[in-house]
Amino acid sequence: SPTPFGPEGQLEDELHKPKAIQTEVKPSVRFNLRTSKDPEHEGCYLSLGHSQPLEDCGFNMTAKTFFIIHGWTMSGIFENWLHKLVSALHTREKDANVVVVDWLPLAHQLYTDAVNNTRVVGHSIARMLDWLQEKDDFSLENVHLIGYSLGAHVAGYAGNFVKGTVGRITGLDPAGPMFEGADIHKRLSPDDADFVDVLHTYTRSFGLSIGIQMPVGHIDIYPNGGDFQPGCGLNDVLGSMAYGTITEVVKCEHERAVHLFVDSLVNQDKPSFAFQCTDSNRFKKGICLSCRKNRCNSIGYNAKKMRNKRNSKMYLKTRAGMPFRVYHYQMKIHVFSYKNMGEIEPTFYVTLYGTNADSQTLPLEIVERIEQNATNTFLVYTEEDLGDLLKIQLTWEGASQSWYNLWKELRSYLSQPHNPGRELNIRRIRVKSGETQRKLTFCAEDPENTSISPGRELWFRKCRDGWRMKNETSPTVELP
């Protein structure tokens, strides 16, 4: 860990102050204790070394203490998400102290200058925490720093500089530019708190990644792969306002991390679960829906403390708005091909029927390609709780929906003009629920008819709990 700053003078030297205030040196970080859920209330400003405001404003020394740390600002005002988060924290933790770290003067700068100010802001928070620790009953264990964007790295510095170890840091889409690939002492990292959990919602492998792509916590959660967030596309943004801009899309995706966290506070009964996976592609294939050995966790405030020796990347799908929870299912489909199918890619859809509800028609996303005479794994998710699954309808879409598919079909036909029938055989579908971890096997409703071709459908009924079937034998594959 780096050594904290030396004399006060050095602290001031590091400040990138706007020209307007260079003449008047003032503490550039304020701590506003939000004493009411009412966002209009001015709250109380805490002052280092002054105990009176703590008493006057009812600071609870034994309760949890949240520090909310904003990021870079173009407007110089608090953004609207802040009040949502304050209110959600008050709702969930009635007795908690909620402190807003106001570093607006230092954040309302060129991005590079604001980045250079993160260290001094982190140091100010650490000094405040060191002072609070001198009070009876105040414990760093009860401190939870919540930093959004650039504020996540400020939280990292604070955790690094404080005497002792803070209980938890939550990074809400930590900023990427100037932090991606940086040394652990110059960004948020797992050694900054007893538990560091991170939500990544705006990561891009091409172009500018507003949020950091690399894992920086004990658990790093990538909702929807950490890139394109539902409800934030240009069309969605256009739909909600008179004009939509790329800026609005960026803001929507970056800020989604905050709303996911707020959701975890206010919709405690609808927790979203994330699943450990090595990468987004494997998750999209449905391979990673295990909860064994701490491989799944709640996201946001409800996350269970996990201190792995190495970073744990976790993934989930979400809805476009609150409550964000969806229900994940892994589907294993063994595809037998009795005819040489060539290169054709089927477009499959499933409809799930449950005791509580039926799903919409859901596409089976083919991440790479359908393997013939092999088990293919898919991820599907529903917005509603279907209850116990009873049956599944599998449809092979008939008419081509894209020029690309049409071209593939034509090419397949040209290479094999004497193969008029395109047919696959599917006897069983194995399903695992991510949320309940329950495994079920569904068998073809008509065991004599297990073939499916474009424009046709197959029905499967639950035939057993679990996945193992008695007397399972592989059918012989007849080639034409």
Epitope: P18, A20, I21, E24, K26, S28, R30, N32, R34, D38, P39, E40, H41, E42, G43, Y45, S75, G76, I77, F78, N80, L82, H83, K84, V100, D102, L104, P105, H108, S240, M241, A242, Y243
Partner: antibody
Amino acid sequence: QIHLVQSGPELKKPGETVKISCKASGYTFTNYGMNWVKQAPGKGLKWMGWINTYSGVPTYAGDFKGRFAFSLETSASTAYLQINNLKNEDTATYFCARRGYYGRRYFDVWGTGTTVTVSS
Amino acid sequence: DIVLTQSPASLAVSLGQRATISCKASQSVDYDVDSYMHWYQQKPGQPPKLLIYAASNLASGIPARFSGGGSGTDFTLNIHPVEEEDVATYYCQQTIEDPPTFGGGTKLEIK
């Protein structure tokens, strides 16, 4: 009781400078931002910008960059608006108005208004 | 910048009747369930006074005959029953993003 009391009316010639004051009382001055709003005779309200009363950082709206300057005297709980190189179109009533740093940032308390007349 | 269009520009209402003023925003001024739309009253020779904040909340000291409603891009201010002292110009304002902008104003007169 919360009050924002502004300085009296001003009659100026084009090219001159005017400095209007807005003295706050009844609340902690640095806990709310101070806005400036222009109202030309018979016209509507136009936001000129605001100053962060804690840090002293001013923000100017697009039409008010250049000749306009916001400043503070924190010890006296007073905000100032200075207009340099006055033009005829600066003839208007100028209001200061406070807004919270938190919440929905409406202007809950307004100054008494200062009428500036620019005439040769 | 967000443009606010108020209608009508002027309004004459009989005492005791209802006055309704509309304000249309060029884009949504909602954030989640909050509306960042506010209403002010300005009497001749006086500064504006906050009437309604966040679309429907009555500011302190304002009589209950004033009410506000709406969400997204369409908002209304209602005064019922109208009294003599309500003669003034009414402005809507959005603060969801800087710069805060005002509507053009609606002048209320008594018939």
